[in-house]
């Protein structure tokens, strides 16, 4: 057992048929010494008397909130929540695997820029008595600050049948220095509670490989004369790290008509500029990566070539 | 330890080029390792963060752009310098800031040629031949110091006399794969910069 | 008619163990939390232990880790097995339907004697 924060404990508890449970002991925070009773959640039934209760906690229905009162008068609380373990794996019920990159990724992040802000989301079908709190280092063994704000409820969605709920919350390195080589990493851990159960999710990553520009900016076409060829031009996205020459992108510029199936026309170039055919009915979108650190590319940004 | 005398090339800005093709060779190198050596901790996840030229030279500090000197988590590991004015273009006049970094960078590429060579003569050593450095990532390495024209005493190649423990050999070269990877990223970054000055 | 029978008391020396059975008639034993309770000579009732519905037992601090409490729902048995008994233990142990031993049984005499 250990507290979660005041007075709110996690239980761990091994979770098999018939398993025997943990044995928790729970302590009045009282001088009183005499004519203590104990309840749980609103029952009014006394599970027992004195200023030390120890209790076997083998299922949901032994955790709870613990209250010892004396003559009719609340004393003290204490919150039990349960962390599940089975066959040596800790339960991973509440969040959904979003299998990207990879299978068990329940926490996905990324960052616009290497200013140290960075981005974390998740997922699940749960709607109702679920909080969350994120916390977050640079390292583990002597770690660095880094400040997470409140997860918020950024998006619902609805997928067949069911809701889905998507969670995030951003987060900032206490001191960061957008040219500095990073040696280790970001860690991310969101302690999430529904109900009565307690699970926590980790992730660990470099800013480098997480980022993810915005698309560019002021994306704009000019004709060039009698010919069927444009000037596409755009700006690097505001919130991309400066100096530009030392943080550069690279951009893909793809020719793309109406119909998903024509084909495709792509332009890769280090300049913020580049002339490309313009077919009727087509667009014309460009996005950007990290010129030097091969990351996420950015969304596209798009014009009709009309 | 002196510092290396700087005479950069007059002429065209001849590192920009060199550095992008140390890029391209060493993050090639880098996958071919991932995927050779497949069963091997050879991931980013999986590896120790290692920097071989950590305290011995600056290169992140003393190649910081000018913009990012007001930065206090920048300037927090050592007395500073900066790129300021001046570039690796026809100007005879380089920046002593300048040349500070460049012989910072020149450092690192000889501090990894040597590591570099090192390994390569203990993989050749391994009987299951599995996986040795890429000529091309050598020669490109060299062909930047060249390039960065510094002069500087060379530094012998290790030797060891004991059994090389290959597979401590190829999660070495792993761990100086990803680091020089990075290091080359932050050269690529700072010739740009240089190039746009 | 609600029914509390127990059994099982004894004299033990220290260090020694017993076993207390309940036999509960006349109510629907498996969902009630079910108490053993004590009355030590001149003294009032002391509680014991509870078991709730599920099984899972609570304890006093005075026998925590010595006594352990259970039930038979099919056979509607509640049982506490008692190990490391010290003469302090010595009473006249009740099983009840709440806490304050309002519905309890006759009681079983344990005395803990060298």
């Known amino acids: 057992i250990w507290e979660l924060k005041k007075d709110v404990y996690v239980v761990e508890l091994d979770w098999y048929p018939d398993a025997p449970g943990e044995m928790v002991v729970l302590t009045c925070d009282t001088p009183e010494e005499d004519g203590i009773t104990w309840t749980l959640d609103q029952s009014s039934e006394v599970l027992g008397s004195g200023k030390t209760l120890t209790i076997q906690v083998k299922e949901f229905g032994d955790a709870g909130q613990y209250t010892c009162h004396k003559g009719g008068e609340v004393l003290s609380h204490s919150l039990l929540l349960l962390h599940k373990k089975e066959d040596g794996i800790w339960s991973t019920d509440i969040l959904k695997d979003q299998k990207e990159p990879k299978n068990k990724t329940f926490l996905r992040c990324e960052a616009k820029n290497y200013s140290g802000r960075f981005t974390c989301w998740w997922l699940t079908t749960i709607s109702t008595d679920l909080t969350f709190s994120v916390k977050s280092s640079r390292g583990s063994s002597d770690p660095q600050g880094v400040t997470c704000g409140a997860a918020t409820l950024s998006a619902e969605r609805v997928r067949g049948d069911n809701k889905e709920y998507e969670y995030s919350v951003e987060c900032q390195e206490d001191s960061a220095c957008p040219a500095a080589e990073e040696s280790l990493p970001i860690e991310v851990m969101v302690d999430a509670v529904h109900k009565l159960k307690y699970e926590n999710y980790t992730s660990s990553f470099f800013i480098r490989d997480i980022i993810k520009p915005d698309p560019p900016k002021n994306l704009q076409l000019k004709p060039l004369k009698n010919s069927r060829q444009v000037e596409v031009s755009w700006e690097y996205p505001d919130t991309w790290s400066t100096p530009h020459s030392y943080f550069s992108l690279t951009f893909c510029v793809q020719v793309q008509g109406k119909s998903k199936r024509e084909k495709k026309d792509r332009v890769f170039t280090d300049k913020t500029s580049a002339t490309v055919i313009c077919r009727k009915n087509a667009s014309i979108s460009v996005r950007a990566q990290d010129r030097y650190y091969s990351s996420s590319w950015s969304e596209w940004a798009s014009v009709p070539c009309s | 330890r002196n510092l290396p005398v700087a005479t950069p090339d007059p002429g065209m800005f001849p590192c920009l080029h060199h550095s992008q093709n140390l890029l391209r060779a060493v993050s090639n190198m880098l996958q071919k390792a991932r995927q050779t050596l497949e069963f091997y901790p050879c991931t980013s996840e999986e590896i120790d963060h290692e920097d071989i030229t950590k305290d011995k030279t600056s290169t992140v500090e003393a190649c910081l752009p000018l913009e990012l000197t007001k930065n206090e988590s920048c300037l927090n590991s050592r007395e500073t310098s900066f790129i300021t004015n001046g570039s690796c273009l026809a100007s005879r006049k380089t920046s002593f800031m300048m040349a500070l970094c460049l012989s910072s960078i020149y450092e690192d590429l000889k501090m990894y040629q040597v590591e570099f060579k090192t390994m390569n003569a203990k993989l050749l050593m391994d009987p299951k031949r599995q996986i040795f450095l890429d000529q091309n990532m050598l020669a490109v390495i060299d062909e930047l110091m060249q390039a960065l024209n510094f002069n500087s005493e060379t530094v012998p190649q290790k030797s060891s006399l004991e059994e090389p423990d290959f597979y401590k050999t190829k999660i070495k070269l792993c761990i100086l794969l990803h680091a020089f990877r990075i290091r080359a990223v932050t050269i690529d970054r700072v010739m740009s910069y240089l190039n746009a000055s | 008619e609600v029914q509390l029978v127990e059994s099982g008391g004894g004299l033990v020396q220290p260090g020694g163990s017993l076993r207390l059975s309940c036999a509960a008639s006349?109510?629907?034993?498996?969902?009630?939390?079910m108490y053993w309770i004590r009355q030590a000579p001149g003294k009032g009732l002391e509680w014991v232990s509870t078991?709730?519905?599920?099984?899972?037992?609570i304890y006093g601090n005075s026998v925590a880790g010595r006594f352990t409490i259970s039930r038979d729902n099919a056979k509607n048995m509640l049982y506490l097995q008692m190990n490391m008994l010290r003469p302090e233990d010595t009473a006249l142990y009740y099983c009840?339907?709440?806490?304050?031993?309002?519905?309890r049984g006759q009681g079983t005499q344990v005395t803990v004697s060298s």
């Open positions: 006349g109510f629907t034993f498996s969902s009630y939390y």
């Open positions: 078991i709730k519905p599920n099984g899972s037992g």
């Open positions: 009840a339907r709440d806490v304050r031993g309002t519905v």
